[in-house]
């Protein structure tokens, strides 16, 4: 069974998301993104900014599939 | 005009599969998503899970071991499928559209009017 | 996981009165809350979101209000259409509801 990280926090997450941010992160900031793994108890879309923070962000959040779709188009 | 609507519940024994069907009108899957939400007789709304405009299904923490949503873009509707039933699961099931007009898919504008599961013996 | 606490039911005012209902949360959500609407044997309205927005389509009686852990829905000059079952919305953290607050016209 995989173990959620100690990660407690929207920034820095290594595996699972605890909490997301709050704020919406300028687009022109991010590089990547990935999904976090379907066994954590959370769903999240951890975005990668170009300084290399990850953030974690719900993926129920409109900017966030905005973001996801202009990422995947390009 | 934009609606969703449920396909028939019914009577279920312990451990069926339901599958439960929501079809779109008036809009496109590739630009809403879809949330299923049920309510237990005389209880509160309960979130099991949802599927965004680009079909990646997420799913409440009690509900993803044994719910898959999908969605058939060609024929506009999506689909719950929810393994091992008990007598928990007797609710009501609604699905509800959203296209993110409300700056997040969980909340949902347009309701489908709900569709009754019974499980039981 | 958030919980959310609703004023318990019935709630009861005149037509024409002032209705209350309140929601708290188990922790800050940052106004990500949604309020709705439901009537026997039918789906739930969307009323508000974010807080204090108005849906498409709701009259401006509805009023919600709130931030952080407390978040109010007022209803100004209620009426008979009124009486129904409300229910918050938390989307910050995992899509919880509220249990609902029954609210009763006499």
């Known amino acids: 069974t995989k173990t959620e990280s100690s990660s407690r926090g929207p920034y820095h997450p290594s595996e699972c998301c605890f909490t997301y941010t709050t704020y919406k992160i300028p687009r022109q900031r991010i590089m990547d993104y990935y999904e976090t793994n379907s066994q954590c108890s959370k769903p999240g879309i951890v975005f990668i900014t170009k300084r290399g923070h990850s953030v974690c962000t719900n993926p129920s959040d409109k900017w966030v599939q905005d973001y996801i779709k202009d990422m995947k188009e390009n | 005009c934009q609606s969703v609507k449920e396909s028939e519940g019914g009577l279920f024994k312990p451990a069926d599969t339901l599958t439960l069907t929501c079809t779109v009108s008036?809009?496109?899957?590739?630009?809403?998503?879809i949330n299923w939400v049920r309510q237990a007789p005389g209880e509160g709304l309960e979130y099991i899970g949802w599927?965004?405009?680009?079909?990646?299904?997420y799913y409440a923490s009690w509900a993803k071991s044994r719910s898959t949503i999908t969605r058939n873009t060609d024929e506009n509707t999506a689909t719950l499928k929810m393994t091992s039933l008990t007598a928990a699961d007797t609710a009501t099931y609604f699905c509800?559209?959203?296209?993110?007009?409300?700056?997040?898919?969980?909340?949902?504008?347009?309701w489908g009017q709900g569709t009754l599961v019974t499980v039981s013996s | 996981a958030v919980v959310l606490t609703q004023t318990a039911s019935p709630v009861s005012a005149p037509v024409g009165g002032t209705v209350t209902v309140k929601c708290q949360a188990s922790q800050t959500i940052n106004n990500r809350l949604a309020w709705y609407q439901q009537k026997q044997g039918q789906p739930p309205k969307l009323l508000i979101y974010e807080a204090s927005k108005l849906a498409s389509g709701v009259p401006s009686r509805f009023k919600g209000s709130g931030s952080g852990t407390e978040y109010t829905l007022t209803i100004r000059g209620v009426e008979c259409a009124d009486a129904a079952t409300y229910s918050c919305?938390?989307?910050?953290?995992?899509?919880?509801f509220g249990g609902g607050t029954e609210v009763v016209v006499k």
């Open positions: 599927i965004s405009d680009v079909g990646t299904a």
């Open positions: 919305q938390e989307y910050a953290d995992e899509n919880i």
């Open positions: 509800a559209g959203g296209d993110g007009s409300y700056s997040n898919y969980w909340v949902s504008d347009i």
């Open positions: 008036g809009f496109s899957l590739s630009s809403f998503a």
